[in-house]
């Protein structure tokens, strides 16, 4: 089969429940901080719903940083069952986005941000420092990323990776357009390409979850992440099978098996296929 033939495989699974975080800091992005140390740490990735490794610079950063995988899991995951991950930009908002602002019972009066379901915007409030609820973010950006809608009512996605046309470099971006794809495969297929920390220039392939294709990149020889394959075939094998295309009303969907093209209609998360 050519790459085109195996590009869009329909896979159905039960949908994950809305993400319920144990602590609001579990929703923070990994922050390596401004320092230059190379320290292996772990953070909770709200999109893959897993604790993942990152390199911490040794100072500042945020609270979504743990010395061990176990500590991360303990703090940020309610159960450690290995479920199939389904990531989509039309995911429901987490339940806590709809909670009212709650300053808690203490008197620290720290500036925090909460999602106001009346105004549909993230707003500043004064947090006392203890208790409260999870509609409580350290930065406006974190609040927007988790709770606000992007254009067209789609939720903001933090982990889009786009190819920069100017210098051909890989740029993780905050993609605010609706994705055409849904992903049901291994979580690392959703991570951006990561050159790593060394100085080699090895030819590798990574799965670009925005465009749904395996693309080449230069690997430094050490570090990086698991979205790193020695061949395009290996990349496709690992990541393509969990990938389906999301299309607007009446569009076409391809499947791996060479059948006639089928009309599909997508309503929110559901795919209705006629004449199967």
């Amino acid at each position: 089969d050519s790459e085109e033939d195996e590009e869009h495989t329909i896979i159905t699974d039960t949908e994950l429940p809305p993400l319920k975080l144990m602590h609001s800091f579990c929703a923070f992005k990994a922050d390596d901080g401004p320092c230059k140390a190379i320290m292996k740490r772990f953070f909770f990735n709200i999109f893959t719903r897993q604790c993942e490794e990152f390199i911490y610079g040794g100072c500042e950063g945020n609270q979504n940083r743990f010395e061990s995988l176990e500590e991360c899991k303990k703090m940020c995951t309610r159960d450690n069952a290995n479920r199939i991950i389904k990531t989509t930009l039309q995911q429901e908002k987490p339940d806590f986005c709809f909670l009212e602002e709650d300053p808690g019972i203490c008197r620290g009066y720290i500036t925090r941000y909460f999602y106001n379901n009346q105004t549909k915007q993230c707003e500043r409030f004064k947090y006392g420092g203890c208790l409260g609820n999870m509609n409580n973010f350290e930065t406006l950006e974190e609040c927007k990323n988790i709770c606000e809608d992007g254009p067209n009512g789609f939720q903001v996605d933090n982990y889009g990776t786009q190819l920069n046309a100017v210098n051909n470099s890989l740029t993780p971006q905050s993609t605010k357009v609706p994705s055409l794809f849904e992903f049901h495969g291994p979580s690392w297929c959703l991570t951006p390409a990561d050159r790593g920390l060394c100085r080699a220039n090895e030819n590798r392939f990574y799965y670009n979850s925005v465009i749904g294709k395996c693309r080449p990149f230069k690997y430094s020889g050490c570090g990086g992440n698991e979205n790193n394959f020695t061949s395009k075939q290996e990349c496709l094998r690992a990541c393509k099978k969990g990938f389906i295309q999301r299309i607007s009303k009446g569009g076409l969907i391809k499947t791996k098996r060479k059948r006639k093209k089928q009309r599909v209609k997508i309503a929110y998360e559901e795919i209705f296929v006629k004449n199967m």
């Epitope: 602590h23 609001s24 800091f25 940083r65 743990f66 709650d102 620290g108 203890c130 208790l131 409260g132």
Partner: antibody, heavy 117, light 109 residues
Framework: QVQLVESGGGLVQPGGSLRLSCAAS????????MTWVRQAPGKGLEWVSA????????YYADSVKGRFTISRDNSKNTLYLQMNSLRAEDTAVYYC??????????WGQGTLVTVSS | DIALTQPASVSGSPGQSITISCTGT?????????VSWYQQHPGKAPKLMIY???SRPSGVSNRFSGSKSGNTASLTISGLQAEDEADYYC?????????FGGGTKLTVL
């Protein structure tokens, strides 16, 4: 002087209910958040529940969520803890404490709750 | 659940200084300047000894002092006296819980 006095403890069967009270005096009760803290025999302290000064928000430890209800009557300077579906592991001395910004600066003498068949 | 870790016991002779440590995770103790310490004699209610890491309530001896570095808080008692023999608990909080350490039994030899 500033004082907290708990009452309502006793022996109850598993699955049973009990209501604890805490009478406050000597300070402006409606200006403080209040908490319940418990201590199982020979064990350490465990936070149970908290309530804001005006009663508008309540908070619970995971171990009691859905079973215990904290409330207050500011006109009577009294804090309550309604305990339902009691279990053997709820056996403890229950203290009410005044919460001053995350720490507990005034404590009652405690009331013993024993859950046993 | 989140926990604050204390040594089960420490001991010292009268007049000596001892330090009790309390180690937390980045989300609780390390994230706020909110560590407090309580003294509890057998059969009695706890008593607040230190709040906001190093502040002493009125009536508490200046032999008691508190500090914090990173995710570890410490209670130091200088000039140990027989009446200091008791259980000591550290306490902090986060978004979901008000948390106590497991307690440290101080024995004055």
């Amino acid at each position: 002087q500033v004082q907290l006095v708990e009452s309502g403890g006793g022996l109850v069967q598993p699955g049973g209910s009990l209501r604890l009270s805490c009478a406050a005096s000597g300070f402006t009760f409606n200006s403080y958040a209040m908490t319940w803290v418990r201590q199982a025999p020979g064990k350490g302290l465990e936070w149970v529940s908290a309530i804001k000064s005006d009663g508008s928000n309540t908070y619970y430890a995971d171990s009691v969520k859905g079973r215990f209800t904290i409330s207050r009557d500011n006109s009577k300077n009294t804090l309550y803890l309604q305990m339902n579906s009691l279990r053997a592991e709820d056996t403890a001395v229950y203290y009410c404490a005044r919460n001053d910004s995350g720490w507990f600066d005034v404590w009652g003498q405690g009331t013993l709750v024993t859950v046993s068949s | 659940d989140i926990a604050l870790t204390q040594p089960a016991s420490v001991s010292g002779s009268p007049g000596q200084s001892i330090t009790i440590s309390c180690t937390g995770t980045s989300s609780d103790l390390g994230g706020f300047n909110t560590v407090s310490w309580y003294q509890q004699h057998p059969g009695k209610a706890p008593k607040l000894m230190i709040y906001s890491v190093s502040s002493r309530p009125s009536g508490v001896s200046n032999r008691f002092s508190g500090s914090k570095s990173g995710n570890t808080a410490s209670l130091t008692i200088s000039g140990l006296q027989a009446e200091d023999e008791a259980d000591y608990y550290c306490q902090s909080y986060d978004l979901n819980n008000l948390v106590f350490g497991g307690g440290t039994k101080l024995t004055v030899l």
